[in-house]
């Protein structure tokens, strides 16, 4: 039951995380105009990975897409790539984890196969989360660098008569959404990997049970396989549960808040 809960919770946490990564990637507020020097600006600038926007005091908002690929900074391209890789891996991980869920039965899928799929999706979630965190962090670092560079030459002009205030940008909401979402996806992935350890019954420690074959006896001793050997485990062994055999009806999934997924 604990394994099912851990797996289900890991799936939901990852699902929320990946939804957050997608949201962050699509958001326009990756960087927002720093209002320190002009808190009552009538024109507010903010930028995303795909377009830059200007919101006027009048309420009018205009957004322009970055219609060039080669003209964009390499760092921005790298951030885009990291976020897309994170989304793709996360989406594949979600697809795999749906079939891996203990509460969902697909034909006569072995528990060991589900364990393998759970581990695979868990690793995908971890990598997805790391990609998102890396992408957001690279962008944040780029912002910090540019912020101090623009602060160094904040005012330029002719003899101080005419001032041209350079627009500085600071962290936008998307960065925080990305960090939290990446962290959630990472946590979800770790939970899936933990759930994998207890999924396959033949990979658990059982008490000594005798199996009488014709001619000689074979005894299965305690000291099960390590969880890390989830791939390629012996699936031909009969499943022997401690505390007596359990009927198929007794091994059931209980309705929970995660059943809508």
């Amino acid at each position: 039951m604990a394994v099912t809960a851990c797996q289900g919770l890991g799936f939901v946490v990852s699902l929320i995380g990946i939804a957050g990564i997608i949201a962050a990637t699509c958001m326009d507020q990756w960087s927002t105009q720093d209002l320190y020097n002009n808190p009552v600006t009538a024109v507010f600038n903010y930028q995303g990975l795909w377009r830059s926007c200007v919101r006027e005091s009048s309420g009018f908002t205009e957004c322009r897409g970055y219609f060039t690929l080669l003209g964009l900074p390499a760092m921005l391209q790298a951030v885009r790539a990291l976020m897309i890789v994170g989304i793709v891996l996360g989406a594949i991980g979600l697809l795999v984890s749906i079939f891996a869920l203990k509460c969902i039965r697909i034909g006569s899928m072995e528990d060991s196969a589900k364990a393998n799929m759970t581990l695979t999706s868990g690793i995908m979630f971890i990598v997805s989360g790391l990609c998102a965190i890396a992408g957001v962090s690279v962008f944040a670092n780029m912002l910090v660098t540019n912020f101090w560079m623009s602060t160094a030459n904040m005012y330029t002009g002719m003899g101080g008569m005419v001032q041209t205030v350079q627009t500085r940008y600071t962290f936008g909401a998307a960065l925080f959404v990305g960090w939290v979402a990446g962290g959630l996806t990472l946590i979800g992935g770790v939970m899936m990997c933990i759930a994998c350890r207890g999924l396959a019954p033949e990979e658990t420690n059982y008490k000594a049970v005798s199996y009488h074959a014709s001619g000689h006896s074979v005894a299965y001793k305690p000291g099960g396989f390590k969880a890390s050997t989830g791939f390629g485990s012996n699936t031909k062994n009969k499943k022997i549960y401690d505390g007596g055999a359990r009927t198929e009806d007794e091994v059931q999934s209980y309705p929970s808040k995660h059943d809508y997924v």
Partner: antibody
């Protein structure tokens, strides 16, 4: 047709109070940022205050900050300017305006005259 | 605050001739986000409220005759009336729409010579 109609102007003594109203029609009032602009007799234009649509952020000219309050009632399609501690230099025609692209004021009312005198 | 300075204070031009009004701001009105200049031109005829002519320094408001044009960037702007008509007699104001407080120029009175 967009219409802005100011009212509430008149003669008031220094230190007194007055509340100007601007009835808007012909457009979705709640969607627009609105402003008050004044013009002293024979002088130029002076921006007084602005109130944004939605969450209603307010901005004021230094000369009226702390004395004037801009507000709006979207259910009544009305813009207000509460003027307290009035001074002789506040004597002017007060215009109600609507903001558009570029923060430009595309529609202006006919104005209401406020005279501060003892 | 951004100070707006118009020149000349008054201008007399013959009918059909070109009229040019200048406006200078103490700070740049160019927004780097959209490369637009937040400067607006208004026309005020005697006894009437001002009328919007041009916003974003060069975008003509709908219904404004095409003889009116705006140009300039950063801190220096110009309103041009290519062929002066009798109905163009008015006071013209430029305005900073870039940052609060919004500030107007002192106005330029345009008359017929």
């Amino acid at each position: 047709e967009v219409q802005l109609l100011e009212s509430g102007g008149g003669l008031v003594q220094p230190g007194g109070s007055l509340r100007l109203s601007c009835a808007a029609s012909g457009f979705t009032f709640s969607s627009y940022t609105m402003s008050w602009v004044r013009q002293a007799p024979g002088k130029g234009l002076e921006w007084v205050a602005t109130i944004s649509s939605g969450v209603s952020y307010t901005y004021y000219a230094d000369s009226v900050k702390g004395r004037f309050t801009i507000s709006r009632d979207n259910s009544k399609n009305t813009l207000y300017l509460q003027m307290n501690s009035l001074r002789a230099e506040d004597t002017a025609v007060y215009y109600c305006t609507r903001l558009t692209k570029g923060n430009a004021m595309d529609y202006w009312g006919q104005g209401t005259l406020v005279t501060v005198s003892s | 605050d951004i100070v707006m300075t118009q020149s000349p204070d008054s201008l007399a031009v013959s009918l059909g001739e070109r009229a040019t009004i200048n406006c200078k701001s103490s700070q740049s009105l160019l927004n780097s986000g959209n490369q637009k200049n937040y400067l607006t031109w208004y026309q005020q005829k005697p006894g009437q409220p001002p009328k919007l002519l041009i916003y974003w320094a060069s975008t003509r408001e709908s219904g404004v005759p095409d003889r009116f044009s705006g140009s300039g960037s950063g801190t220096d702007f110009t309103l041009t009336i290519s062929s002066l008509q009798a109905e163009d007699v008015a006071v013209y104001y430029c305005q900073n729409d870039y940052s609060y407080p919004f500030t107007f120029g002192q106005g330029t009175k345009l008359e017929i010579k």
